[in-house]
């Protein structure tokens, strides 16, 4: 089993984000973008034998983890 990327805190954006609830903060360009499509429904946890963390999930599958949880794959919604 390969692990996903560890939490990348170099840009250390504070929690909570400066964005309104329907938005996510994009660290590449440092501003808020719509991310409502990304957050429902919640995906099943990956099993120990799951494939590598990057598979192109559809928006409805690409749910954000809570703060401190592992990163989840996300289509490049930008």
């Amino acid at each position: 089993m390969r692990r996903g990327p560890r939490s990348l805190r170099g840009r250390d954006a504070p929690a909570p984000t400066p964005c309104v609830p329907a938005e996510c903060f994009d660290l590449l360009v440092r501003h808020c973008v719509a991310c409502g499509l990304l957050r429902t429904p919640r995906p099943k946890p990956a099993g120990a034998s799951s494939p590598a963390p990057r598979t192109a999930l559809q928006p409805q599958e690409s749910v954000g983890a809570g703060a401190g949880e592992a990163a989840l794959p996300l289509p490049g919604l930008l």
């Epitope: 170099g10 929690a15 909570p16 903060f25 440092r30 749910v63 703060a67 949880e69 919604l77 930008l78």
Partner: antibody
Framework: EVQLVQSGGGVVQPGRSLRLSCAAS????????MHWVRQAPGKCLEWVAV????????YYGDSVKGRFTISRDNSKNTLYLQMNSLRDEDTAVYYC???????????????????WGQGTTVTVSS | EIVLTQSPSSLSASVGDRVTITCRAS??????LNWYQQKPGKAPKLLIY???SLQSGVPSRFSGSGSGTDFTLTISSLQPEDFATYYC?????????FGCGTKVEIK
Amino acid sequence: EVQLVQSGGGVVQPGRSLRLSCAASGFTFSSYGMHWVRQAPGKCLEWVAVIWYDASNKYYGDSVKGRFTISRDNSKNTLYLQMNSLRDEDTAVYYCARRFTHLRGWYIEDYGLDVWGQGTTVTVSS
Amino acid sequence: EIVLTQSPSSLSASVGDRVTITCRASQSISSYLNWYQQKPGKAPKLLIYAASSLQSGVPSRFSGSGSGTDFTLTISSLQPEDFATYYCQQSYSIPLTFGCGTKVEIK
């Protein structure tokens, strides 16, 4: 199969225009940001532009700003690069590529370009 | 913009060798560093993202490490199909930038 197929390259005179196309298949194109990257003969890779999944935001490299326009038609699963006022130094192989990101909490982290087109050659010459 | 400096610019190695390529950023980019492989006449292929995460389908002989300004791509046992040019790329900020490549040639 996830695929990006490019077209539209060719030979063009300085000052003229050209439009490149990048047709996507095998994935939900409308969910992905897309990039253009170029590579001049024997040179480094150079990022050209990026467009949001819904075309709401666009960014350009300094060398093409004001001359090139990135756009997309999600109904046709196609990405475009309109190149105006072409210069000799725009001669390169142009690649379209898909943006690769992860969502961590409410933060989007960028992890590069995970799917690339085959490239199309643009030659600017008088 | 963030400048990425790769070294060496080229190297000669034999099948089975351990190969190490370095990439240095002009400022700290945390772990937002990706590695690509490019063969002549082909598009680049993503190998490693987020400095150390192996892209799906990439052989485990490829690995990446580093954070901040100094990064390394390692090929643990060079295979015939690994002779290519390798590029680093930062996704810390716009404009995205690439290193100028390291060409791995047959000794």
